[in-house]
Amino acid sequence: VEVQVSEDPVVALVDTDATLRCSFSPEPGFSLAQLNLIWQLTDTKQLVHSFTEGRDQGSAYSNRTALFPDLLVQGNASLRLQRVRVTDEGSYTCFVSIQDFDSAAVSLQVAAPYSKPSMTLEPNKDLRPGNMVTITCSSYQGYPEAEVFWKDGQGVPLTGNVTTSQMANERGLFDVHSVLRVVLGANGTYSCLVRNPVLQQDAHGSVTITGQPLTF
């Protein structure tokens, strides 16, 4: 028996359902009584779901997995994972045994989009050209970690005096805070771009300083 899975990682958004595809080619006369199917976490060997002795043995993994029972006889051994969490991310191995056995691993990549960044300025009044200001760009509830890029009004990257930190919440999602310290010119726009590297999603925030008032 030959097991086939997708070479590319399966990308799933947090709180959505994902299908980890796995298939085999059944011989003529194949019956489910002959099938042993096991899904497990590749690294830890933890059992996720199994089908043995002619029946679905159910989920061994937080009761959020299911097979496609009507499609098994056609060689579809795919696994459905419901309400995906950050902690589900990783490699899953599909083992199929009929007379001989084969296995293959499929990677699940979890993602969550970042919010539109909020911008804060310190100090935020009585600003003069030549003043040192701290601009903070904050974006929330994304996954995985974000890349943060700063640019000035002409699109020139600002790389000096940037400090970016990540905070992980209890669900494993990240809040990203990036701080730019810059000496003010006569006026100017400072923009931050928060990029989710998996989704290739860019979230933009900017602040324009033109004396008073400030524009966000």
Epitope: V86, P144, A168, L173
Partner: antibody
Framework: DVQLVESGGGVVRPGESLRLSCAAS????????MNWVRQAPGEGLEWVSR?????????YYADSVKGRFTISRDNSKNTLYLQMNSLRAEDTAVYYC?????????????WGLGTLVTVSS | EIVLTQSPGTLSLSPGERATLSCRAS??????LAWYQQKPGQAPRLLIY???TRATDIPDRFSGSGSGTEFTLTISSLQSEDFAVYYC??????????FGGGTKVEIK
């Protein structure tokens, strides 16, 4: 079994460079963030640098090494690196390679045995 | 930067006694705190993560508790192999991923 094996330590003079390597096995290397943690003789643990998983190469550094050290990884070789430039006497330490428990939970569930870096004139 | 303060610096106890180690964070870390054991000449070993979850193959005499800013590692009955240095580490916010200064548990 998870194994992390560091190499590349040695004795160098201040201002010189050194490149540390960490060979990983027993887990899907590309799926995990990796770190370097150091321990000066008789002192506590100090986190040095972290690189996130896959090929995204999002990196972080302790202030004490920022601009001098560069972390990188080669997922095809299951290897983590630390390029250390402009070394100082205060960089003398045992350097440990450590695997993050997951990408969002950065405790260190497996450690290498360490490699000693001595910076001395 | 989150600063972790461990106390006491040294704990002198006899085998069979209960050890209570403290780790205080300068700001809340939720439950994102880990404990490590390090013996002389060895790499650190993960004991506890998530403030209270024992790592793989860690005996149940080790337990962690606390959340927010106050955390405790308890060794219910010290064995000879438990005399070592113990470190706490936060992983809610980085860089840096900070460690406490350590508590040495020595034989009385």
């Amino acid at each position: 079994d998870v194994q992390l094996v560091e190499s590349g330590g040695g004795v160098v003079r201040p201002g010189e460079s050194l490149r540390l390597s960490c060979a990983a096995s027993g887990f899907t290397f590309s799926n995990y963030a990796m770190n370097w943690v150091r321990q000066a003789p008789g002192e506590g643990l100090e986190w040095v640098s972290r690189i996130n998983y896959k090929g995204y190469n999002i990196t972080y550094y302790a202030d004490s090494v920022k601009g001098r050290f560069t972390i990188s990884r080669d997922n095809s070789k299951n290897t983590l690196y630390l390029q250390m430039n402009s070394l100082r006497a205060e960089d003398t330490a045992v350097y440990y390679c450590a695997k993050s428990g997951s990408n969002s939970n950065n405790f260190f569930d497996y450690w290498g045995l360490g490699t000693l870096v001595t910076v001395s004139s | 930067e989150i600063v972790l303060t461990q106390s006491p610096g040294t704990l002198s106890l006899s085998p069979g006694e209960r050890a209570t180690l403290s780790c205080r964070a300068s700001q809340t870390v939720g439950s994102k705190l880990a404990w490590y054991q390090q013996k002389p000449g060895q790499a650190p070993r993960l004991l506890i993560y998530g403030a209270s979850t024992r790592a793989t193959d860690i005996p149940d005499r080790f337990s962690g508790s606390g959340s927010g800013t106050e955390f405790t590692l308890t060794i219910s009955s010290l064995q000879s192999e438990d005399f070592a240095v113990y470190y706490c580490q936060q992983y809610i916010n980085w860089p840096p991923l900070s460690f406490g200064g350590g508590t040495k548990v020595e034989i009385k």
